[in-house]
């Protein structure tokens, strides 16, 4: 058993049918010695008397808010949550496996640049009685500071018969140098509590591996005289790290017909312009990627050919 | 990435082309190592990230773009003295800092070159003959060092008398390649920045 926060405790259970559970001793936070009784949640049934209460915690029915009273007055509370260990592996019932980039990916994180700011998000089908708390650091043995905000519900989607809820959080490394070479990963830890179930999820990454630039901005077409060709030009996204000559991007320019089956023409360039043939009803799209470290491509920025 | 590669203009900063080749070569070598050594811990998540140049050179600090010198988090400076004459500086008026930056890059390359050569000698003794260092990568390191053209004491190649532990050597190779790739990215950024300056 360990304390999650004041008066909230997590009991770790080896979870299998007929498991013996864990013996827990609760102590009433009071100078009083006599006449103390204990109850669980809203029930008025007296579970025991005395300054301490010993209970065998086996199932969720044994978890909840234990309260000690004296003469009708509440003295203190202890909320017991359960953390299930199923065959040596902590349960992951609360969050959905996003399966990208690999199986057992519960937390996904992205950064728009090298400033040390990043966003993480996760999915669940649970809509109520759910709380999250996020902590982060650079490294784990001698952790350096990363400050995270509160997790917020950022999107709701309907997936088949189920509703899916997306939560996200923004974090910022306290003293980040965009040019630094990372040798210790960022660690993100999410505590999730659903009713009386506690779970924790972690992710470990280097900012350089989660970079995904914003799409190029100011995408423009300039027709070339007496030609089917156009000059496409664009700019670095505002959110990208500066100076751009140091934090350079490379670009992919794509000409896509109306039909998805039509052949796509693609050109790769380090410049912020390219000359392409504009077909009728086609669209031109440009996306960006760090020129020197191949992390994710940005989303496409698009303009119609006409 | 297997993308079309632009050839540098003749008037371009001489080292940019070499640094681009270096990054390509080390990335290819790392990819080859990860495929060949699939049963070894060789991915970024599995290895310890060690920097053999730590406390010996200060490339990131010495090569910091001017725009980032206002960022206090970037000024974790280490005092290192370097020789300051190099051919990449030839066609430009350069500050002492730029000379320091390029000589720091040269020292990095020299250190990695020695490590890689020592390691290759060990790998050649492996009866499994599982992996060797790409000669192209070693050649590209050499070319960039020549382009930087710093006069520097030669570091003797380390020779080891004890029987090599090939498992440890291969893990060390992965660690070295990951670190060298990160340094090659920094070198490429620096060369690109200097070219634009």
């Amino acid at each position: 058993i360990w304390e999650l926060k004041k008066d909230v405790y997590v009991v770790e259970l080896d979870w299998y049918p007929d498991a013996p559970g864990e013996m827990v001793v609760l102590t009433c936070d009071t100078p009083e010695e006599d006449g103390i009784t204990w109850t669980l949640d809203q029930s008025s049934e007296v579970l025991g008397s005395g300054k301490t209460l010993t209970i065998q915690v086996k199932e969720f029915g044994d978890a909840g808010q234990y309260t000690c009273h004296k003469g009708g007055e509440v003295l203190s509370h202890s909320l017991l949550l359960l953390h299930k260990k199923e065959d040596g592996i902590w349960s992951t019932d609360i969050l959905k496996d996003q399966k990208e980039p690999k199986n057992k990916t519960f937390l996904r994180c992205e950064a728009k640049n090298y400033s040390g700011r990043f966003t993480c998000w996760w999915l669940t089908t649970i809509s109520t009685d759910l709380t999250f708390s996020v902590k982060s650091s650079r490294g784990s043995s001698d952790p350096q500071g990363v400050t995270c905000g509160a997790a917020t519900l950022s999107a709701e989607r309907v997936r088949g018969d189920n509703k899916e809820y997306e939560y996200s959080v923004e974090c910022q490394e306290d003293s980040a140098c965009p040019a630094a070479e990372e040798s210790l990963p960022i660690e993100v830890m999410v505590d999730a509590v659903h009713k009386l179930k506690y779970e924790n999820y972690t992710s470990s990454f280097f900012i350089r591996d989660i970079i995904k630039p914003d799409p190029p901005k100011n995408l423009q077409l300039k027709p070339l005289k007496n030609s089917r060709q156009v000059e496409v030009s664009w700019e670095y996204p505002d959110t990208w790290s500066t100076p751009h000559s140091y934090f350079s991007l490379t670009f992919c320019v794509q000409v896509q017909g109306k039909s998805k089956r039509e052949k796509k023409d693609r050109v790769f360039t380090d410049k912020t312009s390219a000359t392409v043939i504009c077909r009728k009803n086609a669209s031109i799209s440009v996306r960006a990627q760090d020129r020197y470290y191949s992390s994710s491509w940005s989303e496409w920025a698009s303009v119609p050919c006409s | 990435r297997n993308l079309p590669v632009a050839t540098p203009d003749p008037g371009m900063f001489p080292c940019l082309h070499h640094s681009q080749n270096l990054l390509r070569a080390v990335s290819n070598m790392l990819q080859k190592a990860r495929q060949t050594l699939e049963f070894y811990p060789c991915t970024s998540e599995e290895i310890d990230h060690e920097d053999i140049t730590k406390d010996k050179t200060s490339t990131v600090e010495a090569c910091l773009p001017l725009e980032l010198t206002k960022n206090e988090s970037c000024l974790n400076s280490r005092e290192t003295s370097f020789i300051t004459n190099g051919s990449c500086l030839a066609s430009r008026k350069t500050s002492f800092m730029m000379a320091l930056c390029l000589s720091s890059i040269y020292e990095d390359l020299k250190m990695y070159q020695v490590e890689f050569k020592t390691m290759n000698a060990k790998l050649l003794m492996d009866p499994k003959r599982q992996i060797f260092l790409d000669q192209n990568m070693l050649a590209v390191i050499d070319e960039l060092m020549q382009a930087l053209n710093f006069n520097s004491e030669t570091v003797p190649q380390k020779s080891s008398l004890e029987e090599p532990d090939f498992y440890k050597t291969k893990i060390k190779l992965c660690i070295l390649l990951h670190a060298f790739r990160i340094r090659a990215v920094t070198i490429d950024r620096v060369m690109s920045y200097l070219n634009a300056s």
């Epitope: 979870w15 299998y16 007929d18 | -």
Partner: antibody, heavy 115, light 112 residues
Framework: QVQLVQSGGGVVQPGRSLRLSCAAS????????MHWVRQAPGKGLEWVAF????????YYADSVKGRFTISRDNSKNTLYLQMKSLRAEDTAVYYC????????WGQGTMVTVSS | SYVLTQPPSVSGTPGQRVTISCSGG????????VKWYQQLPGTAPKLLIY???QRPSGVPDRFSGSKSGTSASLAITGVQAEDEADYYC????????????FGTGTKVTVLG
């Protein structure tokens, strides 16, 4: 004590269907994940499928994906395995089993796929 | 489809020490715990070892398990005639959990 009693096995022709049941008692069935495991005659153990305690997630071996469906009825304390498009290579003893560090197995039920 | 490799058979005389190996990889045994099962002919498997080296109550202490890196082993010290059975190791793969990963199985024969 914990008990898992299996039923539903038998002889079936290739291409036909069969449904296995596993009735649980002696524990809170709705709190635990459940597996199906099979063993072809003279061969080793092969995992078939898993279902979460609440039925929200199901996982299958590649060899049965798209043909077998694992389900549970927590109000009846029963686990099921619906087997469709049966093949000769599905011939095996099928076991249900609880998920956890200490597990309980059903007695097994024989499924023979033969024309 | 078996990722955990066991020797097909091992044998010993009563009282001898018999060991069965179970060889896997970094993503399974290297990252997860190992169980061992005993299966007597015509019966369901019986749990002998969980959590690499833990014995459930009722399992004789002549059975012991261990794990090192990407391999595990089961030792029977002082093997007895009633130990003649098939033995299976089991673990998980970090990419496919909760799918059970079984070993190929080992037939233990007690001679004489």
């Amino acid at each position: 004590q914990v008990q898992l009693v299996q039923s539903g096995g038998g002889v079936v022709q290739p291409g036909r269907s069969l449904r296995l049941s596993c009735a649980a008692s002696g524990f809170t069935f709705s709190s635990y994940g459940m597996h199906w495991v099979r063993q072809a005659p003279g061969k080793g153990l092969e995992w078939v499928a898993f279902i979460r305690y609440d039925g929200s997630n199901k996982y299958y071996a590649d060899s049965v994906k798209g043909r077998f469906t694992i389900s549970r009825d927590n109000s009846k304390n029963t686990l099921y395995l619906q087997m469709k498009s049966l093949r000769a290579e599905d011939t095996a003893v099928y076991y249900c089993k609880t998920h956890g560090s200490h597990d309980n197995w059903g007695q097994g039920t024989m499924v023979t796929v033969s024309s | 489809s078996y990722v955990l490799t066991q020797p097909p058979s091992v044998s010993g005389t009563p009282g001898q020490r018999v060991t069965i190996s179970c060889s896997g990889g970094r993503s399974n045994i290297g990252n997860n715990t190992v169980k061992w099962y005993q299966q007597l002919p015509g019966t369901a498997p019986k749990l002998l070892i969980y959590g690499n080296d833990q014995r459930p109550s009722g399992v004789p202490d002549r059975f012991s398990g261990s794990k090192s890196g990407t391999s595990a082993s089961l030792a029977i010290t002082g093997v007895q005639a009633e130990d003649e059975a098939d033995y299976y190791c089991q673990s998980y793969d970090r990419g496919t959990h909760p799918a059970l990963l079984f070993g190929t199985g080992t037939k233990v024969t007690v001679l004489g």
